[in-house]
Interface confidence: low
């Protein structure tokens, strides 16, 4: 069945209740350098007035605090109303290293990143953080980097292993989640001259994704304990038609060309699915298309094989899919699928539908392909246009945590954490905000607030108070590795 | 129990036209879909095509295109096959079946037949 | 369109001994893992009944002694042990690409 009822039941205590920004840009400078300059001025207000130094006086200075950063104020004032106990974000590559390799590192980019996550954990928000968060409209990478091919040349993936060194060198003792890559499955979007085009890339990006995480492996993890993944699109497709042959196989093939794609190779086989690979050859022996996936070494399927810590997806629809067998050598029409708009269902300003119960199918279909593992979903919300009382945010979120929470109590899916998408909206994009662009709270924040302080849908009677130990823990180790690092 | 009921035997004249009927009972009707099975006199079984009674949508045998239309009503829980411009080589008994669809699954198989309807094509 | 020819045409078995009819595709009938093979039994005046479905899946309620094995484009139904009520003409049915087509039938006579 599509929907079943409502369930009412409670996520386990160490569940992770979040939300989830993109990329932040570091504030170059802290905001309120007056504590940080010793000497004294007298304003000639009469005058000319400008500030004239007293020679030979020093006063006493304060050191430099993250709060000097309007940004970050910012950024905790609101996650302080959001209660969430995480928080997701994106650091910007070519900020931190914008040569592309160590030659050149940004301080004090690494600084206000470190001030995001330590003062984060003062309020007891613990950081999921992203290293490379590619957008349709901005590739994200340093300079020399996307002047010398971007991620169609192999040695980007090397350059991204020297810049996750850094980054859990800098940030390591203070983060214990890490997403190398937020949905590397969507790059097809940029990368999509052709169809070897995108695969090549996708290549490189698995190949990145694996350096980094048997970097963090061998060298950081015996002293941080921390966990890395990478995050993938995970939209749930069903057929069209549900009587047509031809439309399940095409749901199926989207999953696998979509997700199975990325997770194949790192959670289970070292290679890609040998379902895509065979329907990409099959096309290519019938004269419709000349991709063909990447063949890979033995060595390379050795890198690539069982390089994650845990399950990270990100989802917000589900897709209504038919076959149509297109010609063309791109990484769409190697696919021949053909998505339909349900016009009779709920949707978004962006037309997004709201289909709470593919979530849960999508859950269980990780699980069947890849294994019972610790899952998080990762993002996952829509575009809600009403500026306060944003009611389809609200709907969307009680339903779709509705359908986590059964996958959770009743299929017994391993699901450690929800992370809504997202904190605040960027002006003239879509409104997936819990805040305005101008940071004007939306009703939504209240409901997901609920959520979180009951641990799900309790029964009536039911506590939703977690043992001292259990709610207190990681902030008393977070507490005191920022007293320990400044 | 699950039946699906045809109607009785037809002869007609060549070039004409005739209608046969589907009747579904013990099960929801719009919840699968019903091909048609044609059988010529001591030969083998060819698949004409199905329509997905929820829709109305149908998919041919190419080899049927023309010569078939498949329709139902819903209201009555009948599938209806129309057969063209009939010749001797459609002297055939004619079989409804149900297939049944299992969440994930896209294997093709017919679990419950009809009766099957003779049809005799003669001047 | 994928054509499955079936052999024997047909043959007789001893009461208790074990019938096998093959079912060869003009190509592949697999699918990521999968068998896309059917069988069924008819009787004469009877409309066909399923026995096997996915190559080697009993549909409930047929008996144990019905079994089918193969995978691409070799087929075989086996009967064993072989009863008076197994008399009737058996077909394969390929589901993995349209046209469904069948086999041309193999009919089995009990001696």
């Known amino acids: 069945k599509e929907s079943t009822p409502d369930v009412q039941g409670q996520f386990p205590c160490d569940f992770s209740w979040g939300v989830t920004e993109s990329v932040l840009k570091p504030e170059s400078v802290a905001s309120s350098p007056q504590f940080s300059d010793p000497h004294l001025y007298v304003w000639n207000a009469t005058g000319n007035r400008l500030l004239h130094r007293v020679e030979g006086v020093r006063l006493k200075t304060r050191p430099a605090q993250c709060t000097d950063f309007v940004n970050i104020k910012k950024q905790l004032e609101m996650l302080a109303r959001m209660k969430v106990t995480h928080y997701r974000f994106a650091l910007d590559w070519a900020s931190v290293l914008p040569t592309g390799n160590l030659s050149a590192v940004n301080r004090q980019a690494l600084r206000y990143y470190r001030c995001v996550v330590s003062e984060g954990l003062k309020l007891g928000i613990s950081a999921m953080v992203t290293l490379y968060y590619p957008t349709h409209a901005h590739l994200g990478l340093p300079e020399p980097l996307l002047h010398a091919d971007g991620w169609l040349n192999p040695s980007t993936a090397e350059a991204f292993q020297a810049y996750a060194g850094l980054c859990f060198q800098e940030l390591g003792d203070l983060v214990k989640l890490w997403i190398t890559i937020n949905e590397p499955n969507r790059l097809s979007d940029i990368y999509n001259r052709s169809g070897n085009d995108t695969y090549g890339a996708a290549h490189n990006l698995l190949v990145a994704h694996a350096l980094a995480w048997r970097l963090y492996d061998r060298q950081f993890r015996p002293s941080q304990r921390g966990a890395v993944s990478l995050s993938l699109h995970a939209d749930w497709a069903e057929p069209a038609n549900p009587y047509a042959d031809s439309h399940w196989r095409a749901a199926e093939r989207f999953l696998q060309f979509e997700i199975a794609w990325f997770a194949e190779p790192l959670f289970k086989t070292g290679d890609y699915p040998a379902a895509m690979r065979e329907y990409i050859a099959s096309k290519h022996r019938r004269g419709l298309s000349s991709s063909a996936l990447p063949r890979l070494t033995e060595a390379e399927r050795r890198l690539l094989k069982g390089t994650v810590d845990f399950c990270a997806l990100n989802h917000f629809t589900t897709r209504f899919v038919m076959h149509e067998q297109l010609a063309g050598s791109r990484y769409d029409s190697d696919r021949d699928i053909q998505f339909l708009q349900d016009i009779t269902r709920l949707s978004s300003p962006t037309r997004l539908a709201v289909i709470p119960w593919g979530v849960r199918k999508l859950l269980r279909w990780v699980r069947r392909n890849y294994g019972d593992m610790d899952i998080y979903i990762t993002a996952s919300g829509i575009d809600d246009q009403a500026l306060e009382d944003d009611r389809l945010r609200k709907y969307y979120l009680g339903k779709y945590l509705q359908e986590v929470l059964k996958a959770y109590l009743i299929d017994k899916v391993r699901i450690k954490g929800y992370y809504a998408f997202k904190l605040a909206e960027e002006k003239s994009k879509p409104r997936f905000g819990f805040f305005t662009s101008d940071f004007k709270a939306k009703s939504s924040i209240q409901f997901y607030n609920k959520v979180i302080s009951s641990r799900g849908f309790p029964f009536e009677n039911s506590s939703s108070r977690c043992s001292q130990t259990q709610e207190n823990t990681e902030c008393t180790v977070c507490l005191f590795l920022v007293q320990k690092k400044p | 129990q699950v039946q699906l009921q045809q109607s009785g035997p037809e002869l007609v004249k060549p070039g004409a036209s005739v209608k046969l009927s589907c009747k579904a009972s013990?099960?929801?009707?719009?919840?699968?879909?019903i091909n048609w099975v044609r059988q010529r006199p001591g030969q083998g079984l060819e698949w004409i095509g199905w329509i997905y009674p929820r829709d109305g949508s149908a998919k041919y045998n190419a080899k049927f295109k023309g010569k078939a239309t498949l329709t139902v009503d819903t209201s009555s829980s009948t599938a209806y096959m129309e057969l063209h411009s009939l010749t001797s080589e459609d002297s055939a008994v004619y079989f409804c079946?149900?297939?049944?669809?299992?969440?994930?699954?896209?294997?093709?198989?017919?679990?419950?037949w009809g009766t099957g309807t003779t049809v005799t094509v003669s001047s | 369109d994928i054509v499955l020819t079936q052999s024997p045409a047909s043959l007789a078995v001893s009461l208790g001994q074990r019938a096998t009819i093959s079912c060869k595709a003009s190509?592949?009938?697999?699918?990521?893992?999968?068998?896309?093979m059917n069988w069924y039994q008819q009787k004469p005046g009877q409309p066909p009944k399923l026995l096997i479905y996915a190559a080697s899946n009993l549909k409930s309620g047929i008996p144990a002694r019905f079994s089918g094995s193969g995978s691409g484009t070799d087929f075989t139904l086996n009967i064993h042990p072989v009863e008076e009520e197994d008399a009737a003409t058996y077909y394969c049915?390929?589901?993995?690409?349209?046209?469904?087509?069948f086999g041309g039938g193999t009919r089995l006579e009990i001696k």
């Open positions: 190509q592949s009938v697999d699918y990521d893992g999968d068998s896309y």
């Open positions: 049915q390929q589901s993995n690409e349209d046209p469904r087509t």
């Open positions: 079946a149900r297939r049944p669809l299992y969440y994930g699954s896209t294997h093709w198989y017919f679990d419950v």
């Open positions: 013990g099960y929801t009707f719009t919840n699968y879909d």
